[in-house]
C-alpha cells in the first residue's frame, strides 16, 4: 500500500485510482497514508469521482479516515439520501495524518471512471473552535504556522500546562480598618488552577471582623469535603475553613489583628465565588465627657483605638493643663482603652493684672480686681500735666488674653506730657531783661558741660539746644550734666537728668557759620512733669502767623546780664520778632562775612538795642504764645549775635525751629 | 525633631541685666505650648521662673515678677528671657522648656560675679 | 505657693528591686503632676507627666500614680541607668513649683 509523500518533504499532491481516466480493474484495494507537519491538517477534494453507486456504498468505495475516526465513505456520482458522493466537498484531517482507502469488488455493471484527488497540507487555526467545545486558550489564542500559543490578561500568569491563566493573586495585604476582598473576577467565574493568598494586617489592638457578602460560589463535592476548589482563612490562633459550596459561611470574629484567606482553584468549573466585608473593633475608650464650657468633637457612639476627639473651648474660654496654656487638645485612644491624655480644662480667659501706666492710673470698672473675659478697665492719665495720647483709655479682657482698646490695640496708651504750659501772664517789661518766677519757664534746661548753655524740654526725654552748644560732647554724650526745675543756676535744689545720645543736624558745620544750629539730647530716662518741669511744644503748622515781625517772643536764661555776669537768677525779655531783610542787611557789613543770616534763621530785638540774649543763654528756647491753643511754643533757638549783647542795630539771631519740624520728628520716632 | 538651645554670658557682674536667649528648631513657639525659662540653683533646687505662650501672653513668678521679663522673635523662632538687677543669688543653671515639660535645652550657667 | 515635698532626700535600692518615690503637695493640685529624672550635667528628662502618664520612649517600669495631694513614682525593676535624682513638679497652680529631689543611690 503507497504511503504517499512524508513530512518533512513538500506535502501536496494527486492521487487516482489505478488505471485512471481509464476504468478501473474488479478486487482492487488501494490505501494511501498521508502525514503532514506537526501543526498542520491535510486538506483534500476530488476532481472526478465516478464508482459504482451501491446500498451504503457496500461494493465499491473510496474511504477517508484520519486517526481512528472515519471522515466519508464515497461512492457513485452524486449523494443520495444514504449515499455520498464528494462532489464539490474539500475534506479535512483531524490530525496531521490522512488514510484513503480505495476499493472495488468482484464486479461492476458498467465501466466507472474511479477517481482524481488532490491533497495539500495546511495550517490548522487551533484558535478556532467549534460552538459547544472548550476554547483552546483560557485568554487569547495567538495562532501561528504550524502551531499556537495562549497568553494571559494582566493580573494572570500561564500556568505550566501552557493554556490555563492562573491569577496573580497572593500578596495583597490590607492595612485599612475595613474593606472588601473577593475572588478574582468575582462576580464572574474564577479561575482555574490559581492559588491565592490574602493578608489583613491591622495594627496590634485591632480585632478583624469578616462577613460573606452577597452570594458565594465555589465548586464543591458530594461527599469529600471540599476536593477540588476551598477557601481558608487562618489567624494566629485557629484556622478556619476550608469552605466552598453555595451556602454563604457565618461571620468570623477573629480576634485577632493579622488574617490570612487563602483561595486555591483546580483546572475545571464554571463558579463565581466570595466576596468577603471585613470590618475591625477594638477596646473602646471611656466616652469623653467635655469640661465645662467646653465641647467634644467629632462625637461618635464610641471610640475605638485609633480614634481620636479634640476639646473647643467656648469664647472666652482657654484650654488649660492646670496652669499651662494649650492652644489645641486631642487625645487618641490606645490598645488598653485608655486615651493618651488626660482631659484638660476650659477656663475662663484670664487677662492677669494689668500694666502699671507711667504717669498714670488704672481703674477696675467691672468689679475689684476682676481681670477675667470682658473685664473692663479704664487708664488715665496724671491731670493737668499729662493727656493720653490716641485711644480713650477704656480696655476689655478679650478671648486672647489681653487687654485690648476700643480700636483694638493691645498696647498700653500713653500718657504724653501737657506741652506749653505757664504760670506766667503775657506783656510786662539774659540782658535787659526781668527775673522768672516759678512755673513761668518750666520748660527752661541749665546745661552744663565744659560751658554753661541752656535747652528747651521736648516730651519728658528730649532736649532741644543750639548744635554749637554741645557739639564738643556730641560723642561724649553723658559727660553732659543736665538740670531742670530750678529758677537758681548755682542751686543744689533741681532735678537731674542724664544724657543718652546727642544729635546734632548734619547740616551744621562747626566753626564756620550757624546755618543749621540745632541740636537734640536724648535723656536716659524720662522725667516727672509737675509745674516746675514741662515741656515747649513744637510750632503747628499755623504758627508762623504768631512769629511775624513784630511779634513779641520771650528768651530766658541764666546768660551774661548786663553787669558782664553769669545771672544766678533764671532771666527772661520779651523782645520783637525783627524784619529778615532788616537783620541780613544788619549782619551784612564787616566784621560780619556775607550770607551770615539765612532763611534757617529768625532775629529778635529792638533797634535800640538793650533786650538781648547773650553768651550763656545758647540753646535756650524763644517761646511765643499761640493764642489759639493757649500753649507756649518754641519758635527760635538762642544761637548768635552781635560782640556786644543788646548793641543798637544789631539782633540776636535765633534758628527757626519751624524750618526744622520733619528732622526733630524723624529723630524722636527712630530714637 | 524638636530641640531648644539656651545662649547667653556666662559671666554677669551684680545689679547688671542678664539676657538669655532659647532658640527652638523642629516646632514653632507660635503654633502650641508654653515656651519656659526654668533654673537650677547649685544644689539642684529647681525653680520655675516663667514663660511666654503660643499666644504672646506671659506668666511670671511672683518672687521675680519685678526684675523679668519674658519676649519673643517669632520671625527667628526664639524667645528671651532678661532679669535686671542681678545678685550673686540668680547664679544658676538656666534650662529653657516647652510644657508640657516634653522638650529641655541643655541649660546654659550663668554666674553673677564682681 | 504650693510646696512639693519629697521627704527622701536619698533612697537605697539594688537592680532589679521595685523602688517608690513619694511627694506630697501642701495643697490639692489634681492630676497636674509631673516627675523628671536628672543625671549629673545633664538636663531634667520628662518621665511622667499628669501624675500617670508616661512621655512616649519612657520603659513601662516607671509607673506614676496618685491624685490630689500624693503622688508615687514607682520603678518596677531597678536598672543600673536608673541611679539619678527624681523631681516632682506640680503645674497646677500658679507659680508652677518643684519638689527638691530624690537622689536614687546602689546599696
Known amino acids: 500500500t503507497p504511503l504517499g509523500p512524508k513530512w518533512p518533504e513538500p506535502v501536496f499532491g494527486r492521487l487516482a485510482s489505478p488505471g485512471f481516466p481509464g476504468e478501473y480493474a474488479n478486487d482492487q484495494e488501494r490505501r494511501w497514508t498521508l502525514t503532514a507537519p506537526p501543526g498542520y491538517r491535510l486538506r483534500l477534494y476530488f476532481t472526478h469521482f465516478d464508482l459504482e453507486l451501491s446500498h451504503l456504498c457496500e461494493y465499491d468505495f473510496v474511504k477517508l479516515s484520519s486517526g481512528a475516526k472515519v471522515l466519508a465513505t464515497l461512492c457513485g456520482q452524486e449523494s443520495t439520501d444514504t449515499e455520498r458522493a464528494p462532489g464539490k466537498d474539500t475534506f479535512y484531517s483531524l490530525g496531521s495524518s490522512l488514510d484513503i482507502t480505495f476499493r472495488s469488488d468482484y464486479s461492476n455493471e458498467k465501466p466507472f471512471t474511479g477517481f482524481e484527488a488532490f491533497y495539500a497540507a495546511e495550517d490548522i487555526d487551533e484558535c478556532q473552535v467549534a460552538p459547544g467545545e472548550a476554547p483552546t486558550c483560557d485568554h487569547h489564542c495567538h495562532n501561528h504556522l504550524g502551531g499556537f500559543y495562549c497568553s494571559c490578561r494582566a493580573g494572570y500568569v500561564l500556568h505550566r500546562n501552557k493554556r490555563t491563566c492562573s491569577a496573580l493573586c497572593s500578596g495583597q495585604v490590607f492595612t485599612q480598618r475595613s474593606g472588601e476582598l473577593s475572588s478574582p473576577e468575582y462576580p464572574r467565574p474564577y479561575p482555574k488552577l490559581s492559588s491565592c493568598t490574602y493578608s489583613i494586617s491591622l495594627e496590634e489592638g485591632f480585632s478583624v471582623i469578616l462577613d460573606f457578602v452577597e452570594s458565594f460560589d465555589v465548586e464543591t463535592h458530594p461527599e469529600t469535603l471540599c476536593p477540588y476548589d476551598f477557601l481558608k482563612i487562618q489567624t494566629d490562633r485557629e484556622e478556619h475553613g476550608p469552605f466552598c459550596g453555595k451556602t454563604l459561611p457565618h461571620r468570623i470574629e477573629t480576634k485577632s489583628n493579622t488574617v490570612t484567606i487563602t483561595f486555591v482553584t483546580d483546572e475545571s468549573g464554571d463558579h463565581t465565588g466570595w466576596k468577603i466585608h471585613y470590618t475591625s473593633t477594638a477596646q473602646p475608650c471611656p466616652y469623653p465627657m467635655a469640661p465645662p464650657n467646653g465641647h467634644v468633637s467629632p462625637v461618635q457612639a464610641k471610640y475605638i483605638l485609633k480614634d481620636s476627639f479634640s476639646i473647643f473651648c467656648e469664647t472666652g474660654y482657654e484650654l488649660l493643663q492646670g496652669h499651662l496654656p494649650l492652644k489645641s487638645f486631642t487625645a487618641v485612644c490606645q490598645k488598653d482603652g485608655s486615651w493618651d491624655r488626660p482631659m484638660p480644662a476650659c477656663s475662663i480667659v484670664d487677662c492677669g493684672p494689668p500694666d502699671d501706666l507711667p504717669s498714670g492710673r488704672v481703674e477696675y470698672i467691672t468689679g475689684p480686681g476682676v481681670t477675667t473675659y470682658k473685664a473692663v478697665i479704664q487708664y488715665s492719665c496724671e491731670e493737668t500735666f499729662y493727656t493720653m495720647k490716641v485711644n480713650d483709655g477704656k480696655y476689655v479682657c478679650e478671648a486672647d488674653g489681653f487687654w485690648t482698646s476700643s480700636k483694638g490695640e493691645k498696647s498700653l496708651p500713653v500718657c504724653e506730657p501737657v506741652c506749653g504750659l505757664s504760670a506766667r501772664t503775657t506783656g510786662g517789661r539774659i540782658y535787659g531783661g526781668q527775673k522768672a518766677k516759678p512755673g513761668d519757664f518750666p520748660w527752661q534746661v541749665l546745661i552744663l558741660g565744659g560751658t554753661t548753655a541752656a535747652g528747651a524740654l521736648l516730651y519728658d526725654n528730649w532736649v532741644l539746644t543750639a548744635a554749637h552748644a554741645v557739639y564738643e560732647q556730641k560723642h561724649d554724650a553723658s559727660a553732659l550734666d543736665i538740670r531742670m526745675g530750678t529758677l537758681k543756676r548755682l542751686s543744689p535744689h533741681y532735678t537731674q537728668a542724664w544724657s543718652e545720645a546727642v544729635f546734632i543736624h548734619e547740616g551744621y558745620t562747626h566753626d564756620a557759620g550757624f546755618d543749621n544750629d540745632i541740636a537734640l539730647i536724648k535723656l536716659n530716662n524720662k522725667v516727672v512733669i509737675n509745674s516746675n518741669i514741662t515741656p515747649i511744644c513744637l510750632p503747628r503748622k499755623e504758627a508762623e502767623s504768631f512769629m511775624r515781625t513784630d511779634d513779641i517772643g520771650t528768651a530766658s536764661g541764666w546768660g551774661l546780664t548786663q553787669r558782664g555776669f553769669l545771672a544766678r537768677n533764671l532771666m527772661y525779655v520779651d523782645i520783637p520778632i525783627v524784619d529778615h531783610q532788616k537783620c541780613t542787611a544788619a549782619y551784612e557789613k564787616p566784621p560780619y562775612p556775607r550770607g551770615s543770616v539765612t532763611a534757617n534763621m529768625l532775629c529778635a530785638g529792638l533797634e535800640s538795642g538793650g533786650k538781648d540774649s547773650c553768651r550763656g543763654d545758647s540753646g535756650g528756647a524763644l517761646v511765643f504764645l499761640d493764642s489759639e491753643t493757649e500753649r507756649w511754643f518754641v519758635g527760635g533757638i538762642v544761637s548768635w549775635g552781635s560782640m556786644n549783647c543788646g548793641e543798637a542795630g544789631q539782633y540776636g539771631v535765633y534758628t527757626k525751629v519751624i524750618n526744622y519740624i520733619p528732622w526733630i520728628e524723624n529723630i524722636i520716632s527712630d530714637f | 525633631d524638636v530641640q531648644l538651645q539656651e545662649s547667653g554670658p556666662g559671666l554677669v557682674k551684680p545689679s547688671q541685666s542678664l539676657s538669655l536667649t532659647c532658640t527652638v528648631t523642629?516646632?514653632?513657639?507660635?503654633?502650641?505650648?508654653?515656651w519656659n525659662w526654668i533654673r537650677q540653683f547649685p544644689g539642684n533646687k529647681l525653680e520655675w521662673m516663667g514663660y511666654i505662650s503660643y499666644s504672646g501672653r506671659t506668666s511670671y513668678n511672683p518672687s521675680l515678677k519685678s526684675r523679668i521679663s519674658i519676649t519673643r522673635n517669632t520671625s527667628t523662632n526664639q524667645f528671651f528671657l532678661q532679669l535686671n538687677s542681678v545678685t550673686t543669688e540668680d547664679t544658676a543653671t538656666y534650662f529653657c522648656?516647652?510644657?508640657?515639660?516634653?522638650?529641655w535645652g541643655q541649660g546654659t550657667t550663668l554666674t553673677v560675679s564682681s | 505657693d504650693i510646696v512639693m515635698t519629697q521627704s527622701q532626700k536619698f533612697m537605697s535600692t539594688s537592680v532589679g528591686d521595685r523602688v517608690s518615690v513619694t511627694c506630697k503637695a501642701s495643697?490639692?493640685?489634681?492630676?497636674?503632676v509631673a516627675w523628671f529624672q536628672q543625671k549629673p550635667g545633664q538636663s531634667p528628662k520628662p518621665l511622667i507627666y499628669?501624675?500617670?502618664y508616661r512621655y512616649s520612649g519612657v520603659p513601662d517600669r516607671f509607673t506614676g500614680s496618685g491624685s490630689g495631694t500624693d503622688f508615687t513614682l514607682t520603678i518596677s525593676n531597678v536598672q543600673s541607668e536608673d541611679l539619678a535624682e527624681y523631681f516632682c513638679h506640680q503645674y497646677n497652680t500658679y507659680p508652677l513649683t518643684f519638689g527638691a529631689g530624690t537622689k536614687l543611690e546602689l546599696n
Open positions: 523642629g516646632y514653632s513657639i507660635t503654633s502650641d505650648y508654653a
Open positions: 495643697q490639692n493640685v489634681g492630676s497636674n
Open positions: 499628669s501624675a500617670s
Open positions: 522648656a516647652r510644657y508640657w515639660g516634653d522638650y
